[in-house]
Amino acid sequence: ALDAAYCFRNVQDNCCLRPLYIDFKRDLGWKWIHEPKGYNANFCAGACPYLWSSDTQHSRVLSLYNTINPEASASPCCVSQDLEPLTILYYIGKTPKIEQLSNMIVKSCKCS
Amino acid sequence: ALDAAYCFRNVQDNCCLRPLYIDFKRDLGWKWIHEPKGYNANFCAGACPYLWSSDTQHSRVLSLYNTINPEASASPCCVSQDLEPLTILYYIGKTPKIEQLSNMIVKSCKCS
């Protein structure tokens, strides 16, 4: 799987999970989240050559097309596969609220 | 939706459905498909600026992060959303066979 266990231990130019820490205030301008101050969001990036973690029949066809027509602009793209939520603490007035924000952390990637 | 109805009628640099005709023989090296000779596979391409058809909370966060940190390499990518099958005719010896190949045609796109 193109997850942390694989991607963070290997130098990989192809589609893989990449580490990305996001500071809510600095990187997003969000001041309303009290805790955490930031989180490991991660992201997906890298080339999608033929048969590399292809998601669908179309992405396989597209990567094969791209192999035969390398000058073409049509090629699969490296995107998130499995995502996890992030639990945050914020305040409404003086009342603390705990909420789970869905699909905030990328755990693995695919070529789609 | 970033589908043919919208994308094929508008000049759009952002993520959108793009027309792509694939000739089975020429583009994939597949000689076994008798009919059709090719098909409109389409593909997804274009920029994914903040809030442009974001698929998940993570892709929204990433596009906002990219707006504030434009030099960063982390950004969402334009990929297929809805896919449809393609019906093909091929032969086993002299016997014609009809088969449906799943997920062969992209109908719409998203930023993921």
Epitope: Q12, C15, L51, S53 | G29, W30, W32, Y90, I92
Partner: antibody
């Protein structure tokens, strides 16, 4: 039903040539690649190479490049594996297998045992 | 040259779960396929595309991937599952590579 039928066992002397065959039936022969796999006595599987019968494009494992030739005749739905000069170390079971472009072998031949001995 | 590493042998008690691993540098991206070979027979595909099962293969057989390791899991192991199991995948040049094989013994 899908079948890959291989030619019978062969006993040869070192230096002799040999061509073994694999006939596909029950499917569109040019839709799938045909791969060849070697299994030496008591050992594991080794991929030798494959051919796309539709285009005659071949790809060989570096270990077998120049040692064997893979070919196909799509008119009779048959793939071939041949040696121009056999060695004792070529003694093995050879399997052909049907392979989609996406990479797995879904049907296998029954195997051809090649014995090379002086 | 690129290698896929499997344990030489795995033992499992009848009715229990057997896990056979396969590790290699590219297994994160190129999916592993698994083959079963019984003595004197040709190999049979049991898992393809990392976790898909061909028709006729029991649901007891499943595949998964984590990091650079692919795992074949056989639940409720039966005597008839005794065989050699091979993983296969690609190196970065799209050359097919087989693992060395694992002999499964059902006790």
């Amino acid at each position: 039903q899908v079948q890959l039928v291989q030619s019978g066992a062969e006993v040869k002397k070192p230096g002799e040539s040999l061509k073994i065959s694999c006939k596909g039936s029950g499917y569109s022969f040019t839709r799938y690649y045909v791969a060849w796999v070697r299994q030496m006595p008591g050992k594991g599987l080794e991929w030798m190479g494959w051919i796309d019968p539709g285009t005659s494009n071949t790809r060989y494992s570096p270990s077998f490049q120049g040692q064997v030739t893979i070919s196909a005749d799509k008119s009779i739905s048959t793939a071939y594996l041949q040696w121009s000069s056999l060695k004792a170390s070529d003694t093995a079971m050879y399997y052909c297998a049907r392979m989609l472009a996406w990479g797995w072998f879904d049907y296998w031949g029954q195997g051809t045992l090649v014995t090379v001995s002086s | 040259s690129y290698e896929l590493t499997q344990p030489l042998s795995v033992s499992v008690a009848l009715g229990q779960t057997a896990r056979i691993t396969c590790s290699g540098d590219n297994l994160g991206g190129y999916y592993a396929h698994w083959y079963q070979q019984k003595p004197g027979q040709a190999p049979v595909l049991v898992i393809y595309d990392k976790s898909d099962r061909p028709s006729g293969i029991p649901e007891r057989f499943s595949g998964s991937n984590s990091g650079n390791t692919a795992t074949l899991t056989i639940s409720r192991a039966q005597a008839g599952d005794e065989a050699d199991y091979y993983c296969a995948s690609y190196d970065s040049s799209l050359m097919m590579v087989f693992g060395g094989g694992t002999k499964l013994t059902v006790l």
